[in-house]
Interface confidence: low
């Protein structure tokens, strides 16, 4: 999908409002420190690229993101203020439900919502990191 | 109305340093990253770097990494590019401008050097 | 470093012309280029960015494409105030590079 079409200020305001502290809630317990962050993205359709990959690509030892509140508040975020996005993601859809039984926090997991915390604020401050 | 205002032209000697001002207003200055493009007489347009005016960050091209130097003032909300050991080739229109994903949408008028001895 | 290779480097038109300019990359930059306009003495002004999404204030007339590292700026009926340089740059990441220009000339 091309994210480039998408209305950022009102995704940054969903992502302030509710996405952010939904992430937080999901780290608690962790230490801010603990996992370095790899994934970078540079421009903000960039980084919506990454988000949605992190949040809903199943990868190994994480598979059960995308029913968690900040995931699915992305994916309404996407929904509403990315033209087209929606039809995009049937399939993805059904291949999420497949891959995804219950709900399981594992050390991948923290690790990858980590990542996703240094996208998101990424993507409120774009430029900060090239490639 | 976002406007970047730049200082005035300047008439400089081979050697000598130049600082160039960019007073920006009406947005919020540290919401957006400032760059600096340069256009010698008849030429193209040359990116010089970037600085983040929220905690000063700054990206400089490898040319410029020992001559340039750009600043921010928040109090002020403007923005500077010193460059030293000017010498001829350096003479040229020196733009700043605004930018949240890389393109710019807003400029300075530009401000001449001229490097002349 | 991404090399952007802008043609043709000037083109005689006449209003009411359709112009097409093309800027291609050296790699793959996505939809990160934009597209200015630069009359003499004038700072550039914003015409597109992300390839395809027209600037605040900017006429119909001018559009942009992308097909895989090439672009597309498009002037489809020449108007007398369009007679100027036209420059692409990605925005994909440093060092931020620019076209070598397009000078669009009245025939």
């Known amino acids: 999908y091309d994210f480039t079409n998408c209305d950022f200020e009102k995704i940054k305001a969903a992502y302030l409002s509710t996405i952010s502290k939904d992430l937080i809630t999901y780290m608690s317990g962790t230490k801010s420190t603990e996992f370095n962050n790899t994934v970078s993205c540079s421009n903000r359709p960039h980084c919506l690229t990454e988000i949605q990959s992190l949040t809903f690509n199943p990868t190994a030892g994480c598979a059960s993101l995308a029913k968690e509140m900040f995931a699915m508040k992305t994916k309404a975020a996407l929904a509403i203020w990315c033209p087209g996005y929606s039809e995009t993601q049937i399939n993805a859809t059904q291949a999420m439900k497949k891959a995804r039984k219950s709900k399981v926090t594992t050390n991948k997991c923290l690790e990858q919502v980590s990542q996703l915390q240094g996208l998101w604020r990424r993507f409120n401050r774009p430029l900060l990191k090239q490639q | 109305e976002v406007q970047l205002v730049q200082s005035g032209a300047e008439v400089k000697k081979p050697g000598a340093s130049v600082k160039v001002s960019c007073k920006a207003s009406g947005y919020t200055f540290t919401t957006y990253w400032m760059h600096w493009v340069r256009q010698a007489p008849g030429q193209g347009l040359e990116w010089i770097g970037m600085?983040?005016?929220?905690?000063?960050?700054?990206t400089l091209i490898q040319k410029f990494k020992d001559r340039a130097t750009l600043t921010v003032d928040k109090s002020t909300s403007t923005a500077y590019m010193e460059l030293s050991s000017l010498r001829s080739e350096d003479t040229a229109v020196y733009y700043c401008?605004?930018?949240?994903?890389?393109?710019?949408?807003?400029w300075g008028q530009g401000t001449t050097v001229t490097v002349s001895s | 470093d991404i090399q952007m290779t802008q043609s043709p480097s000037s083109l005689s038109a006449s209003v009411g012309d359709r112009v097409t300019i093309t800027c291609r990359a050296s790699e793959n930059i996505y939809s990160y280029l934009a597209w200015y306009q630069q009359k003499p003495g004038k700072a550039p002004k914003l015409l597109v960015y992300f390839a395809k999404t027209l600037a605040e204030g900017v006429p119909s007339r001018f559009s942009g494409s992308v097909s895989g590292t090439d672009f597309t700026l498009t002037i489809s009926s020449l108007q007398p105030e369009d007679f100027a340089t036209y420059y692409c740059?990605?925005?994909?990441?440093?060092?931020?590079?620019f076209g070598g220009g397009t000078k669009v000339e009245i025939k």
């Open positions: 740059q990605h925005h994909y990441g440093t060092p931020w590079t």
């Open positions: 401008a605004r930018t949240l994903d890389g393109y710019y949408d807003y």
């Open positions: 600085i983040d005016p929220s905690d000063s960050e700054t």
